[in-house]
């Protein structure tokens, strides 16, 4: 019996969901009641989900699987894996029995796209050409490992006085911390490009250093020019941070936190005490830094409506604020492409493609194209709708007259994570069904 | 128009000295890398180095490091390359190219003309 | 110096013909760039920032990437496409180029 699964791996972000294919051709008059079909983890053997006398028998992993019990009887014997985790990753064994045997194993290659990098500088302040700063680069929550990549502002690499670190979490997501130590010249720029290297996804940051000296008198408030990026249901770091001067003590500090443009308060510290959150009991500061001048608050469990502006006071003697703007973002679903008519094709026929993506956000852009690249603009139709989270659904609609043959893609691209999502369809030019029947 | 423009060909005697100048137009001189690229006949591409024209900033490729000597003009807007101790596999064509982008992605963008240097004795 | 192996060195393909070049890198590289060159011409900015086209690059050109491997795809290739490919790095010094890989038409 021949079963059929993808060579590639199949590649699923952390906390969606994947479908590991898995096909065999049933022979005429074939019954569920004579399929035995498992799914089990390729090294240790571990049962994942089966289906034995007529009946699917279920998950027995961690109740994250599912069949598609409707389309069992037509050879496809596909695996979903809900909530995907790091830990998930690895190849997993098709099993089908029906009078004959076959099997065949799928990998799954799980990934989380990096952060936008937050720099750092140590030291901060005062600094003169000729000073030696450290300039630190800090992405989280990617996997797998990232490559990290140091340029200035010619596009020079610097790889001398470089050193990375990367630690997992309990998920097993990465940190990453680069470090570079420079010389200051009269002016620089240095830049750092954090990769995932299964994603593709490149994520950067740059820092401007002019020396100088610090004017004097309010307290000087540093917040990133750039928008956080933060990905819906993941936690995100709003940097603030301040320069404490020699003798400062935390009783000396209010430290408020608010949206920008409402003015309701978001989290506070004043009297020598964290005051708590006042935004949905999903904000923290970090303690144990302020003392050191990070007055950076954390954001847990990010949702699209949290996306804005968060203003962040300082006042010690004398006073002072900066906004940072918070951009959320989710990932689109890889499309799933339907045709209408979708049977006995023939050249000359009108049809329609839809291509549809799901649970994203912002709003996406989509690009049609023919099989050797030529966009496709015409005859497009695409709508998005916000769900109750307020993450977008899309469904693009192409209409066109069949030629002798033809391909079709569609690419859903998420506009802030540059996340490109495509699927595409390929029309024969003899009579046809879609999907190809087995 | 944004130009490179390198002078003329030159012909050589084996341990003798060649400099090739490469005039830039159309932009700030000072805002981008220039970088000096040979091809030897029927050959590939190969870098010798680079001058940050604003601060002077050099770096060479080991292979030429000893034998190169990159240097810029800000007032009249020119590259130079000059190459010591010349051997007959220094026979090429030398190109200056602009290495230009926005962080962090960068690429040669214009190229000059070339200046075929040919080491005969 | 991370070394740029360009394959194959040398290809004849027929018009409309779909063509594939590899640039394998010996280590991982920030992003890669790739130029065209045609006889007695310099080279001409084809690719930058791994798979954008620069100004006037006809859309049949495209760049995926596996890895460590680089690959530029002509997807119906036209008689202006014959010239040499080169790819090219700045990762770390030295900056590298491929060893090119020469396209011919049948």
């Known amino acids: 019996l021949e079963v059929q699964v993808p060579e590639d791996p199949v590649v699923a972000l952390v906390g969606t969901d994947a479908t590991l294919c898995c096909s065999f051709s049933p022979e005429p008059g074939f019954s569920l009641a004579q399929l035995n079909l498992i799914w089990q983890l390729t090294d240790t053997k571990q049962l994942v989900h089966s289906f034995a006398e007529g009946q699917d028998q279920g998950s027995a992993y961690a109740n994250r699987t599912a069949l598609f019990p409707d389309l069992l009887a037509q050879g496809n014997a596909s695996l979903r894996l809900q909530r995907v985790r790091v830990a998930d990753e690895g190849s997993f064994t098709c099993f089908v029995s029906i009078r004959d045997f076959g099997s065949a194993a799928v990998s799954l290659q799980v990934a989380a796209p990096y952060s936008k990098p937050s720099m750092t500088l140590e030291p901060n302040k005062d600094l003169r050409p000729g000073d030696t700063v450290t300039i630190t680069c800090s992405s989280y929550q990617g996997y797998p490992e990232a490559e990290v990549f140091w340029q200035d502002g010619q596009g020079v690499p610097l790889t001398g006085n470089v050193t990375t670190s990367q630690m997992a979490n309990e998920q097993g997501l990465f940190d990453v911390h680069s470090i570079l130590r420079v010389v200051l010249g009269a002016n620089g720029t240095y830049s750092c490009l954090v990769r995932n290297p299964v994603l593709q996804q490149d994520a950067h940051s740059s820092v401007t250093i002019t020396p100088q000296r610090s004017p004097t008198g309010a307290v000087e408030v540093q917040v990133p020019e750039d928008p956080v990026v933060a990905l819906v249901g993941t936690d995100a770091t709003l940097r603030c941070s301040f320069s404490p001067e020699p003798g400062f003590s935390l009783a000396q500090l209010n430290l408020i936190w608010q949206l920008t443009d409402t003015k309701q308060l978001v989290h506070s510290f004043t009297e020598g005490r964290d005051q708590g959150s006042a935004y949905a009991n999903r904000t923290a500061l970090f303690p144990d830094l302020l003392a050191q001048g990070n007055a950076s608050l954390r954001l847990q469990r990010v949702r699209v409506a949290d996306e804005g502006s968060f203003t962040c006071f300082v006042s010690i003697r004398d006073f002072g604020s900066a906004a940072v703007s918070l951009q959320v973002a989710a990932p689109y679903s890889k499309p799933s492409m339907t045709l209408e008519p979708n049977k006995d094709l023939r050249p000359g026929d009108t049809v329609t493609i839809t291509c549809s993506s799901y649970r994203g956000y912002p709003e996406a852009e989509v690009f049609w194209q023919d099989g050797q690249g030529v966009p496709l603009t015409g005859n497009v139709t695409t709508s998005q709708m916000a769900n109750e989270q307020g993450l977008f659904d899309v469904h693009s609609v192409l209409r066109v007259v069949l030629g002798a043959n033809g391909t079709y893609s569609c690419l859903v691209r998420n506009p802030v994570l540059q996340q490109d999502a495509h699927g595409s369809v390929t029309i024969t030019g003899q009579p046809m069904t879609f999907p190809p029947e087995a | 128009e944004v130009q490179l423009v390198q002078s003329g060909a030159e012909v050589k005697k084996p341990g003798s000295s060649v400099k090739v100048s490469c005039k830039a137009s159309g932009y700030s001189f000072t805002s981008y890398t220039i970088h000096w690229v040979r091809q030897a006949p029927g050959q590939g591409l190969e870098w010798i180095g680079y001058i940050n024209p604003n601060s002077r900033n050099t770096d060479y490729n080991q292979k030429f490091k000893d034998r190169t000597t990159l240097t810029a003009d800000r007032s009249t807007s020119t590259a130079y390359m000059e190459l010591s101790s010349l051997r007959s596999e220094d026979t090429a064509v030398y190109y200056c190219?602009?290495?230009?982008?926005?962080?962090?992605?960068?690429?040669?963008?214009?190229w000059g003309q070339g200046t075929t240097v040919t080491v005969s004795s | 110096e991370i070394v740029l192996t360009q394959s194959p060195d040398f290809q004849s393909v027929t018009p409309k013909e779909k063509v594939t070049i590899t640039c394998r890198a010996s280590s991982s590289v920030s992003y890669m760039n790739w130029y065209q060159q045609k006889p007695d011409q310099s080279p001409k900015p084809w690719i930058y920032?791994?798979?954008n086209l620069a100004s006037g690059v006809p859309s049949r050109f495209s760049v995926s990437v596996s890895g460590t491997d680089h690959t530029l795809t002509i997807n119906s290739l036209e008689a202006e496409d014959a010239a040499t490919y080169y790819c090219?790095?700045?990762?770390?010094?030295?900056?590298?180029f491929g060893q090119g890989t020469k396209l011919e038409i049948k």
């Open positions: 920032a791994t798979s």
């Open positions: 190219a602009r290495y230009s982008g926005s962080t962090p992605y960068w690429y040669f963008d214009v």
């Open positions: 090219q790095q700045w990762s770390s010094n030295p900056l590298t």
